[in-house]
């Protein structure tokens, strides 16, 4: 199952179930862990372990919690105010600016280079030239992850209204 949020993954715009806590918006916004009701009068709590909101908002939905992909480990579970934190398994890494997937770390350095940094969940091994000490950027090109959009929820007539 994809860990990416598409429109289909948003919690539906529905009246709060009886067990969902309600409070009043403050200056039109609801606190983290809540979303606003359709009439704008109530803040409805997100469902623990299912969806979340991390910031003050007037969203009509909470966001679906991420499920860690295979090849990832869960560092911390999803709460009503924070999404799941996933980390690449040992021997794989995901760079800060690379697509959202874990890539295998290289097992060794090219000829004429020495390893100066280990594989971590966020970086490949680091190699430098024996003589010059200059870094080697690594030959493995970033793998693109293709995400196609799904039809999702029908468009709201007054989105991001301004």
């Amino acid at each position: 199952e994809s860990a990416l949020i598409t429109q289909q993954d948003l919690a539906p715009q529905q009246r709060a179930a009886p067990q969902q806590k309600r409070s009043s918006p403050s200056e039109g916004l609801c606190p983290p862990g809540h979303h606003i009701s359709e009439d704008g009068r109530d803040c409805i709590s997100c469902k623990y372990g299912q969806d979340y909101s991390t910031h003050w908002n007037d969203l009509l939905f909470c966001l679906r919690c991420t499920r860690c992909d295979s090849g990832e480990v869960e560092l911390s579970p999803c709460t009503t105010t924070r999404n799941t934190v996933c980390q690449c398994e040992e021997g794989t890494f995901r760079e800060e600016d690379s697509p959202e997937m874990c890539r295998k770390c290289r097992t060794g350095c090219p000829r004429g280079m020495v390893k100066v940094g280990d594989c971590t969940p966020w970086s490949d091994i680091e190699c430098v030239h024996k003589e010059s000490g200059t870094k080697h950027s690594g030959e493995v090109p970033a793998v693109e992850e293709t995400v196609t959009s799904s039809p999702g929820t029908p468009a709201s007539p007054c989105s991001l209204s301004g």
Partner: nanobody
């Protein structure tokens, strides 16, 4: 992939207002997750505001809550960030980001399309 171009930055006095624009081209934005991030000198990119193009509502960082508002104009394919009561600590390069799907809406890594940024300087 969508192309984004920000504008509207500049020098403003504390307490003043600015409206940033993010013009999108390349494809329709229906269903897109849209966010504003900012980057102050020597710091990482910080989440500012989030919304979905064709759904109501937005989320705001604590630091801008009640002062900044995200909006959009369908006919112009443009996202806006209205910034009021500006403070010196709002000084940064502001970036617009978009993605058809996101993993964590407040994480810069979740977005695959970025504008080049527009500089906002708040100073007297």
């Amino acid at each position: 992939e969508v192309q984004l171009l920000e504008s509207g930055g500049g020098l403003v006095q504390p307490g003043g207002s600015l409206r940033l624009s993010c013009a999108a081209s390349g494809r329709a934005l229906t269903g897109y997750h849209m966010s504003w991030f900012r980057q102050a000198p020597g710091k990482g990119r910080e989440f500012v505001s989030y919304g979905i193009w064709d759904r109501a509502g937005a989320a705001y960082a604590d630091s801008v809550k009640g002062r900044f508002t995200i909006s959009r104009d369908n006919s112009k394919n443009t996202l806006y960030l209205q910034m009021n009561s500006l403070r010196a600590e709002d000084t940064a390069v502001y970036y617009c980001a978009a993605s058809m799907a996101v993993r964590t809406y407040y994480s810069p890594r979740s977005y695959d399309s970025w504008g080049q940024g527009t500089l906002v300087t708040v100073s007297s």
